[in-house]
């Protein structure tokens, strides 16, 4: 299915416009910002949503910028150039001409320059650390059903195979999740790591994404398991290009 | 030829215990889940659990309240079942049912399951 | 705890003819529902997943509908060979679930 046919809405993205105007009647829905037909089957790609989010009112909930923690993007939220497939252009640029090369998950992985950079490939992110840390608890977490629950809300919530979450680091307070999606990994149809990192961190900020479904509660054998801050690192097949200089800043 | 095959079933004592195999052939173990579903003459089919062999992540019915736990020995591409103080209730055939690799949870590939009867 | 309620639990077809099953989700589980087929001594056999989606080798006779907490199970054409137990399974999670399977539904074939 394309949308939920009865009321014709996007289970997996809110940020959407939907209309039985499909083949045969059928519900279609069309991210905001960007006007594409999305998959409601599975996740919007992380660029579309950035769009979309740029796009809503400026009093809208969902802009509430990252915490200075979330490292998502240290350059805070642009509104990106998305290629048809609805992914990242390697090269994106502001609208005072400032340019600069982003990999995957649309993170700046070169100095900023004007026009004239050349980005030659959308660098992919194939190693995703997220840090979190949860708030106090009578006890620390058992860590085979903490990583067990981590798991099944990967695949369940966020549709994303077990094998490419890698690992679930757990020392109280912290918990880290390693996930892991090479190139030659991701099949068709598989739910890219960055995508569903992204979905990850607004669920966990108290910003979900999915239509109707209710917010992340997440529960460890029933203790709610509440988290208080949120670090995401990203790895690219091929290291990022800064300066010395901001290498040493 | 992918397969699986249940093993170990047979009479047991009210309040007994028994633990069942499932030997996997023909496919990588670790690229699966696999459940336990059991079924009780003549009554419909009753999941009891769940377990994901790579990670050895297990996930369990609510009614089995720890009285039944799941495991594998994934260089032998085998799953378990132990099952304890068992009742009559128990009595029924257990099948393997493996996942279609896929993150949803349907079971493509079952073996022909194993008669346990729980009776004195 | 998602609850699988299957109706009707027996009914009868005639050769060459078409029944419905029914099976209702107790609360949303958007297209993640699978049906089975199974006959007397043999393990259950996936027939549809995704709501709507024939498994390998499963004859085009059988057909599957509905998103949400609504679902059906339309088999046409009905032949001797179909006479089985149907069941519905929710594919959506395995957490905190106490039986993702329903009741079951007899088909008899006369």
């Known amino acids: 299915h394309t949308a939920a046919q009865d009321n014709c809405t996007c289970p997996t993205n809110k940020m959407t416009v939907c209309s039985p105007d499909g083949p045969g009647g059928r519900c279609q829905c069309r991210a905001l910002g960007s006007g594409m037909a999305v998959d409601c089957s599975t996740l919007t790609s992380k660029c579309l949503l950035l769009k979309a989010r740029m796009s809503a009112p400026k009093n809208a909930r969902t802009l509430v910028r990252p915490s200075e923690h979330a490292l998502v993007d240290n350059d805070g939220l642009y509104d990106p150039d998305c290629d048809p497939e609805g992914r990242f252009k390697a090269r994106q640029c502001n609208q005072t001409s400032v340019c600069w090369c982003v990999n995957s998950v649309g993170v700046r992985r070169t100095d900023k320059g004007d026009l004239s950079l050349r980005c030659d490939e959308l660098v992919r992110t194939h190693h995703i650390l997220i840090d979190l840390r949860h708030r106090p608890t009578a006890g620390a977490f058992n860590h085979s059903d903490l990583d067990a629950e981590l798991r099944r809300l990967f695949r369940e919530r966020y549709r994303l195979h077990p094998k490419f979450v890698a690992a679930v680091h757990y020392e109280q307070p912290t918990i880290q999740i390693e996930l892991r999606q090479n190139t030659s990994q991701k099949a068709a149809g598989d739910v890219d790591i960055g995508d569903a990192a992204y979905y990850f961190e607004r669920d966990i900020k108290g910003e979900s994404l999915f239509q109707g479904r209710g917010g992340l509660d997440l529960r460890v054998r029933g203790e709610p398991l509440q988290v208080e801050r949120t670090l995401i690192y990203y790895l690219d097949e091929i290291p990022p290009k800064f300066s010395m200089k901001r290498l040493t800043a | 030829q992918e397969q699986l095959k249940e093993s170990g079933g047979g009479l047991v004592q009210p309040g007994g215990s028994l633990t069942l195999s499932c030997k996997a052939s023909g496919f990588d173990f670790n690229n699966y889940g696999v459940s336990w579903v059991r079924q009780a003459p003549g009554k419909g089919l009753e999941w009891i659990g769940y377990?994901?062999?790579?990670?050895?992540?297990?996930y369990y019915a609510t009614w089995v309240n720890g009285r039944f736990t799941i495991s594998s020995h994934n260089a032998q591409n085998t799953l378990y079942l132990q099952l304890n103080t068992l009742t009559a209730a128990d009595t029924a055939t257990y099948f393997c049912?493996?996942?279609?690799?896929?993150?949803?949870?349907?079971?493509?590939?079952w073996g022909p399951g194993t008669l346990v009867t729980v009776s004195s | 705890d998602v609850v699988m309620t299957q109706t009707p639990a027996s009914v009868e077809v005639a050769v060459g003819g078409t029944v419905t099953i029914k099976c209702q989700a107790s609360?949303?589980?958007?297209?993640?529902l699978a049906w089975y087929q199974q006959k007397p001594g043999q393990p259950p056999k996936l027939l549809i997943y995704e709501a709507s989606k024939l498994a390998s080798g499963v004859s085009s006779r059988f057909s599957g509908g509905g998103y949400g907490t609504e679902f059906t199970l339309t088999i046409s054409g009905v032949e001797c060979a179909d006479a089985a137990t149907y069941y519905c399974q929710q594919a959506l999670t395995v957490g905190n679930v106490d039986n993702p399977f329903g009741g079951g539904s007899e088909v008899v074939v006369k």
């Open positions: 609360e949303d589980i958007e297209s993640y």
């Open positions: 377990i994901y062999p790579a990670y050895h992540n297990t």
């Open positions: 049912a493996r996942d279609t690799g896929s993150t949803d949870y349907n079971f493509n590939l």
